[in-house]
């Protein structure tokens, strides 16, 4: 039975040209996390494999940085980065857990950032 839950940064906004940290945290399960995949709508952005470490998609390497932790940092944001992002936790023996974050990139310099989630 899958007992785990994923907490995320939820809906967040950021300023064009700036950067943002996407964070997810899996709790309430003793399952082993084997890999975390980060996806943007229909594009695979990055993979963090427990054995092999971080691997960023070559097409996003200039704007995506691993971490902190299992999170993902998006840099040099453009309005086109607005949309849904998913953290997919591959675990054993539970299976797959998915968290969703909505990012809005604003032209304005007064972008209101959503509540920041920090993993202890």
């Amino acid at each position: 039975m899958m007992t785990g839950t994923i907490e995320t940064t939820g809906n967040i906004s950021a300023e064009k040209g700036g950067s943002i940290i996407l964070q997810c945290h899996l709790s309430s399960t003793t399952a082993q996390v084997t890999q975390v995949n980060w996806e943007q709508q229909d594009q695979l952005l990055a993979i963090c494999n427990a054995d092999l470490g971080w691997h960023i998609s070559p097409s996003f390497k200039d704007r995506v940085a691993p971490g902190p932790g299992l999170g993902l940092t998006l840099q040099s944001l453009t309005v086109n980065d607005t949309g849904e992002y998913f953290c997919i936790y591959h675990t054993y023996p539970d299976g797959t857990y998915t968290g969703r974050i909505f990012l809005e990139v604003l032209e304005s310099s007064v972008a209101e950032h959503g509540a920041r989630f920090q993993i202890p």
Partner: antibody, heavy 117, light 107 residues
Framework: EVQLVQSGAEVKKPGASVKVSCKAS????????IEWVRQAPGQRLEWMGV????????NYKEKFKGRVTITADKSSSTAYMELSSLRSEDTAVYYC??????????WGQGTTVTVSS | DIVMTQSPDSLAVSLGERATINCKAS??????VAWYQHKPGQSPKLLIY???YRYTGVPDRFSGSGSGTDFTLTISSLQAEDVAVYYC?????????FGGGTKVEIK
């Protein structure tokens, strides 16, 4: 120029072990994964496992766990794949490949391993 | 394990004509798919990665598309040197499984 040069063909008896080497040159060895893939006669390509030479971390296909060991020697930029308890169905061409984001952009020339009594 | 199912198993196409190869993943793999060309006696060669990105030096007659579970490799105008077996591979999660291959021949 990126190159992966593998060791030569091997003939082994059932129950024996084989160790195939893969010497990398032309790039920073610790910055990329080394993956091992085999192809038995008439079969599809089959992924066996992978090593991160920088960290030493490995990941193996479940069916090979306990029988395959992948190692890497940073000083010589060489990766090794050892397969034990060989059986006839292990007869195949074994390839090492450089892993970039888990796809394989450069391949070794292949090493034919024949298991026969 | 994620199963990659390729179709057709073989394909005969006239020179200059279009060849289309399909690959279906047994579960979601986002854009984590690569395509390889394998000629007899040679090592496989990377053509496409991340579903649609052409690898350096690959002729532009090769293109890839798809996301999720359904993927396509297209050779827009088949040349004699394109005769080979083509494999899809998912690089979304370990183990990094391959399709069964599609043999492309000249009609």
């Amino acid at each position: 120029e990126v190159q992966l040069v593998q060791s030569g063909a091997e003939v082994k008896k059932p129950g024996a072990s084989v160790k195939v080497s893969c010497k990398a040159s032309g790039y920073a060895f610790t910055n990329y994964l080394i993956e091992w893939v085999r192809q038995a006669p008439g079969q599809r390509l089959e992924w066996m496992g992978v090593i991160n030479p920088g960290s030493g971390g490995t990941n193996y296909k479940e069916k090979f766990k306990g029988r395959v060991t992948i190692t890497a020697d940073k000083s010589s930029s060489t990766a090794y794949m050892e397969l034990s308890s060989l059986r006839s169905e292990d007869t195949a061409v074994y390839y090492c490949a450089r892993g970039e984001y888990f796809f394989f952009d450069y391949w070794g020339q292949g090493t034919t391993v024949t298991v026969s009594s | 394990d994620i199963v990659m199912t390729q179709s057709p198993d073989s394909l005969a196409v006239s020179l200059g004509e279009r060849a289309t190869i399909n690959c279906k993943a047994s579960q979601h793999v986002s854009t984590g798919v690569a395509w390889y060309q394998h000629k007899p006696g040679q090592s496989p060669k990377l053509l496409i990665y991340s579903a649609s990105y052409r690898y350096t030096g690959v002729p532009d007659r090769f293109s890839g598309s798809g996301s999720g579970t359904d993927f396509t490799l297209t050779i827009s105008s088949l040349q004699a040197e394109d005769v080979a077996v083509y494999y899809c591979q998912q690089h979304y999660n370990t183990p990094h499984t391959f399709g069964g291959g599609t043999k492309v021949e000249i009609k």
